[in-house]
Interface confidence: low
């Protein structure tokens, strides 16, 4: 007769490992007992269990509660055992030694491989700002056994770099995604994809990109200079900008306080019926955490009865 087993048994951490050992003998042959031991190189054999045809299963104290026979029905020639709740430390070489009658003893070895699926983590890089050079957008780390694969899935143009750290029973892989920040990347997903034989499907962690920027500010409302005359109703200045984080707007008048009756509503400055007191240099100050921008306009309210030119000065600054 001969022993049937597997060269390698692979199990995911926490699952039960079936260690197969089946004696395929001639008719009339019997199995008296099956002894299981762990036999890692350089270390003495450590007994797991003894499976006796008459007295049943005896488990060594070190494996008490962790070694069982497979559920019935059982074949008397089957010396397989179940190792419950496999841990990384269980990984190694195992030997089954089968005592048969009348053929004598047989032995076979197998290797137990315990897969440790990774628990990936994604860490965003420093705050992204338009105008930076190549910048770390995010790093993704996954540790497992064997080493996991870490890749990126995104529409964003960038570069990746990976490094691996080997530990005694596992390996940690870190992949970094670098990019040159631009405002068009705002809201774009950057997904870390981790593959591993211990995972039923790839694990994905998505990070939404936020790029700080502040567009130049400009003021609309002075396109038709002739409308800025005494008595005009509904005159307004609107400050235009965009940014991430969304900017806040502040209106001031450079050459004095805002005249009474002028309404500030966020990005808009609304005027009551115009008088000459509304003349002056108005400043829209746009700011977010990234930067600040100014746009200035000079308003000169004229008497429509007079045929004089009007100076309008537009200045944007950053």
């Amino acid at each position: 007769g001969e022993l049937e087993t597997s060269d390698v048994v692979t199990v995911v951490l926490g699952q039960d490992a079936k260690l197969p050992c089946f004696y395929r003998g001639d008719s009339g042959e019997q199995v008296g007992q099956v002894a299981w031991a762990r036999v890692d190189a350089g270390e003495g054999a450590q007994e797991l269990a003894l499976l006796h045809s008459k007295y049943g299963l005896h488990v060594s104290p070190a494996y008490e509660g962790r070694v069982e026979q497979p559920p019935p029905p059982r074949n008397p020639l089957d010396g397989s055992v179940l190792l419950r709740n496999a841990v990384q430390a269980d990984e190694g070489e195992y030997e089954c030694r089968v005592s048969t009658f009348p053929a004598g003893s047989f032995q076979a070895r197998l290797r137990l491989r315990v897969l440790v699926p990774p628990l990936p983590s994604l860490n965003p890089g420093p705050a992204l700002e338009e105008g930076q050079g190549l910048t770390l957008a995010a790093s993704c780390t996954a540790e497992g056994s064997p080493a996991p694969s870490v890749t990126w899935d995104t529409e964003v143009k960038g570069t990746t770099s990976s490094r691996s750290f080997k530990h005694s029973r596992s390996a940690a892989v870190t992949s970094e995604f670098h990019l040159v920040p631009s405002r068009s990347m705002n809201g774009q997903p950057l997904t870390c994809v981790v593959s591993h034989p211990g995972l039923l499907q790839d694990q994905r962690i998505t990070h939404i990109l936020h790029v700080s920027f502040l567009a130049e500010a400009s003021v609309r409302g002075l396109e038709d200079q002739n409308l800025w005359h005494i008595g005009r109703e509904g005159a307004m200045l609107k400050c235009l900008s965009e940014g991430q984080p969304p900017p806040s707007y502040n209106w001031t008048r450079l050459d004095g306080p805002l005249p009474s009756g002028v309404r500030v509503d966020g990005d808009t400055l609304g005027f009551p019926p115009l008088t000459t007191e509304h003349s002056g240099i108005y400043v829209c100050h746009v700011s977010n955490e990234f930067s600040s921008r100014d746009s200035q306009v000079t308003v000169d309210v004229l008497d429509p009865q007079e045929d004089s030119g009007k100076q309008v000065d537009l200045v944007s600054a950053s």
Partner: antibody, heavy 116, light 107 residues
């Protein structure tokens, strides 16, 4: 009324460190970029460092990069300049200034003397 | 880095004269130049921003002009309190530079 008041100057030996502060009042500090400008005795103005409103971005002149660190505490409306590995050529009056992108308000300045 | 060159280094005038101080940038900076006055033992004071924009509280005799690379600070009828050092300044790529200054002194 906008006020910028520097403090923390003094005499320090070469290679040592010093931290100067600038307490701001009279405006919403967190809306403004801030800067440090220095002036060596009998010399002109020299920009040293600046920081954006949220404190995310900092910028330095080449000669102080790696030695000076500008920071801010928006809750305390205070600007800081940590100066390490000081050299004799860092001797100057250090001004705190509000910028956007000109320096519209300046503090009275604080004297830093680096000498053995 | 953009270099600002101020001329002349020293300007000697008598009160009542009108003067022009020059600031030249090594490359075009649109209207991104700002002017400061620094009196002896005082902090600098902003006079003009964005080449020509006046600042509240600054006497009207101070005016600025220019764009691109050539800028001028004009003082109409210099008064005794105007004898100071005048600096131009610009910002480029988040870095700031000053000119070396023009000293306005009593002739």
């Amino acid at each position: 009324e906008v006020q910028l008041v520097e403090s923390g100057g003094g005499l320090v030996q070469p290679g040592r460190s010093l931290k100067v502060s600038c307490a701001a009042s009279g405006f919403t500090f967190s809306n403004y970029d801030m800067a440090w400008v220095r002036q060596a005795p009998t010399k002109g103005l020299e920009w040293v460092a600046s920081i954006n409103p949220g404190g995310i971005s900092t910028y330095y002149r080449d000669s102080v990069k790696g030695r000076f660190t500008v920071s801010r505490d928006n809750e305390k409306s205070t600007l800081y300049l940590q100066m390490d590995s000081l050299r004799s050529e860092d001797t100057a009056t250090y001004y705190c200034a509000r910028r956007q992108p000109y320096f519209d308000y300046w503090g009275q300045g604080v004297m830093v003397t680096v000498s053995s | 880095n953009i270099v600002l060159t101020q001329s002349p280094a020293t300007l000697s005038v008598t009160p009542g004269e009108s003067v022009s101080l020059s600031c030249r940038a090594s490359q075009s900076i649109s209207t991104g130049i700002h002017w400061y006055q620094q009196k002896s033992n005082e902090s600098p004071r902003l006079l003009i921003k964005f080449a020509s924009q006046s600042i509240s509280g600054i006497p009207s005799r101070f005016s600025g002009s220019g764009s691109g690379t050539d800028f001028t600070l004009s003082i109409n009828r210099v008064e005794s309190e105007d004898f100071s050092i005048y600096y131009c300044q610009q910002r480029d790529s988040s870095l700031f530079t000053f000119g070396a200054g023009t000293k306005l002194e009593l002739k």
